[in-house]
Each structure stands twice: as C-alpha cells, then as structure tokens.
Interface confidence: low
C-alpha cells in the first residue's frame, strides 16, 4: 500500500477508508459504500482464505489500537463475474461485513459516481490514499497517506501500457515533475475525484510513480449498476449472496 509523493492526512479525515487485513497484516485498501458493504479490488482476494480476513474501519495508524477503529470479519465476497486476473479487467469486488459499521466522525460512507456519470476527464484533480510503504524500499508510513494526482488521457496511458488497457480502466499522473501515486499493494483503495469514488487502485509499474507506466485504476463509473445490483440482491439475514464466495469451511 505504497503512496508515493504524498502526505499524511489529518487523522480520520478520510472516514470512508477501509484496511483489508490478512494474517494481521494490512493487505489492501477499500472504501465503505454502506454500513455493511466495502468496495475493493478483486485481485486482493485471489488465493486468500476469507476466514483470516478482517476489515478495519476508522483507522489512521494501523499499528495502534485506536478507539475509533471498528473491526469486522468478511461475511461474503462478490467478485465481478468478468474479472480477469491476467489482464486486471473488471478488477472490482464487494465485501459484505459480518456486522454493520457505526457511522460517526471517523467512519463514513463514500459515494460512487451516479449511474449515468462519465469518468472524470483528463486533467481532473483527484486524490488517492493508502497505508503502506512510502518508498520503493518498504518504508512504512506514519499514518494514512494521500497523494494528489491528475487523471491522464486514456490514449496516452494506453500507449504507455502498450495497448493493454481496457475502456473500463482509468489512469492518473502526478501533474508535475514529482513521482506521485500508488504502488501495487494500495490496491482496492479509492481514487476520489469531485468527492466521489471514481477509481479503485488496480495496478502500476515496477517502480512507484514511474510516469512511463502510469497508475491504473478500475473505472468505478462502469460498474455502478453492478454494484447496486449486488447490494439490492442482498438479503438482510446472514448468508451468501447469489454468485458470491463463502469463506471456506462454512456451510451454505
């Protein structure tokens, strides 16, 4: 979860941020969509035992048991049906928590774009946040970090990635000469533009913030209908959603 060229945010000023942990370690980001729903990247959960997964809300310093933190297990995972691990296409999933978050100053919701919204245009100022390394050398951050980035022209980005991007991806650049952005383990965290979650951290290049391989996000606007369909199909009683993966070892 490396944010490069960023700054530490005011504690709990990004109350929608979720930390997804496996084996007690921060693994991916995500954002709180509803009191019981977190949106993240599908690739974060490849070959992962959901029974060992936790979602932490209301955090700033992950290594500290802050009184604002709320910790949940993962009740169900819904990965986009067209997710392709090799290409990162449709790299999005929904986590249903095993309890409802209590909303307050440190825990809040982030809205996705409207159903008919287009992605943010090239040059739009956005921000991306995460908890992991702040350099290529595994330097840990003091707390939640955030970098200010700008949306990159899709044609330019696609050329940089040798034509491997799809139309449901979104790219950012630093907007100046500094290296600024994310690295791979920031995955699932939101790209916030105009106060909406327009992107989900998906993949980047070998070196953090390298302009030759711009940061690539899942374009949330392309999946809004799917997101709300999954939420709508959810029943209030516990149990897996249709098409969802239940943590191994649990009975249906």
């Amino acid at each position: 979860a490396q944010i490069i060229g960023g700054h530490e945010v005011t504690p709990h000023s990004r109350p929608y941020m979720a930390s997804v942990r496996f084996g007690g370690q921060h693994h991916c980001g995500g954002f709180l969509l509803r009191a019981r729903w977190v949106v993240s990247a599908a690739h974060c959960f490849s070959h992962r035992d959901l029974r060992t997964g936790l979602v932490v809300l209301g955090a700033h310093v992950l290594s500290t048991a802050e009184p604002t933190q709320q910790v949940f297990g993962i009740d169900a995972l819904t990965t986009h049906p067209d997710y392709h691990p090799m290409t990162h296409a449709n790299d999005i999933c929904l986590l249903r928590l095993n309890g409802s978050a209590v909303l307050g100053p440190a825990v809040g919701l982030l809205r996705p774009p409207g159903r008919r919204a287009r992605p943010p245009t090239a040059g739009t100022r956005c921000r991306v946040a995460g908890w992991g390394f702040v350099s290529d050398f595994e330097e840990l951050p003091p707390g939640l970090m955030e970098a200010k980035v700008r949306v990159l022209d899709p044609d330019v980005c696609n050329s940089s990635w040798k034509g491997h991007l799809t139309l449901t991806m979104l790219c950012t650049r630093s907007g100046d000469s500094h290296r600024r952005g994310f690295c791979s383990a920031d995955s699932g965290g939101p790209l916030v533009c105009r106060n909406r979650a327009h992107g989900l951290v998906s993949f980047s290049g070998l070196w953090c913030g390298d302009p030759k391989t711009p940061d690539v996000y899942t374009q949330v606007s392309a999946f809004v209908a799917w997101i709300w369909d999954v939420v709508r199909r959810s029943s209030p009683q516990p149990g897996p959603l249709p098409g969802t993966t239940r943590p191994p070892g649990e009975a249906a």
Epitope: T121, P154, L167
Partner: antibody
Amino acid sequence: EVQLVESGGGLVQPGGSLRLSCAASGFTFSSTAISWVRQAPGKGLEWVGEIYPSDGYTDYADSVKGRFTISADTSKNTAYLQMNSLRAEDTAVYYCARVKWAVSSLGVMDYWGQGTLVTVSS
Amino acid sequence: DIQMTQSPSSLSASVGDRVTITCRASQDVSTAVAWYQQKPGKAPKLLIYSASFLYSGVPSRFSGSGSGTDFTLTISSLQPEDFATYYCQQSYTTPPTFGQGTKVEIK
C-alpha cells in the same frame, strides 16, 4: 483515412422497424466508442446512444430506450442501430460518429458519417 | 440531463468580422465542451474540444474558451466558408447534450 459510412435508411411506417449500419475503416474499431446522433429536419442534434465495441457496453437516450438497440460486429468493423416501434418523431437524418478520448474530455465525436435519412410516415 | 443553451440563435455578419457565440450549461461541466460546425446537407465537423483545444486541421481563426458553465466560440475573422450552423456539446455526463445551434448568416 478514417471513414464512417451509414446505410439502411428509408421510408418506414409508424410501428415499423429499420436497421442502420455504420461501416468503419481507417482506425482500430474496438479501441473507441461509436455514437449515433440524429437530426430531425430543420432541427438540432440529438444524441441517440453509443456502444463500446470492445465489450459491447451500450448506453441510450431516454427517448429511444427500449425501442432502439445498438450493437457492433468487430470482425466487420461495423456498428448497427436497430430501430423498432418507430414513431413519426423518429424521422431524422441519423449519423454515426467515432467517439474519441481527448485531453480533459470524454465523448468527443471527431469523425462523422455522411448520415442516412429515416422517414417514419404512413 | 444537462441543458446547453446557445446564444444568439442566429446572427448576421460580414466577411472579416469577429464573431462570438456563447453556450451556457445548466450545471458545471468542467471543460468537457466541444464545438461543431455544420453546413446544410452535411455532417457536423469538430472544431474545438475540451473547451479550448483546436482540433487538428481547423484554422486558427477559431478559438474556444470557458469552464464550468459558460463557454465561448470565437471566429476572429469570418471567412466565406465559415457561414454555417455551430453547435456546442457537453461530454461531462451521459447523455451528451447539444446546444440548439447558432446559424451564422451573411449580412
């Protein structure tokens, strides 16, 4: 050279159907979107809908939703507009246009076909 | 839907005149506005995209400006081939919407 050529227009009775084609050449068909835009006689431009040929994603104007269907055949570099339950108010010249990404904007229609006239009348 | 309102709806001008057409969006559309030129019986042609970027091959006498809700297309010195109808279009949200057009006629 980028080219878009529409065909399939003509006279049709109210309630009837028509399928328009838009043959594209000179660019990578699957890397952009194709929009359909219409223009009633003496009137302005109205967006009808669009398709992303790479994955078949479509979007439509409310005025045609449920009646019109946009599709694409990437092997033929051709987009289609299937128009059902046609009404007199659908009478227009129908254009297809390439939708190009652009700096700080999406949805710029940089190349247009010559248009094909659809007349709905009894 | 976002409404795009052009003014004037028509204007008369002479060759060499400076012509300004304005377009107002019903809500903030950032700089996601394009301008098109259309001549009778022909398809529209892209002139300006992203509010101020001149499209390839378009003469430099055309320019665009604005952001947010107010946009302007300027023809610095009107030429005989510029007599046509001009449309603005927003591409900020779906559906893309056009202005009603401004017809530039010979005085």
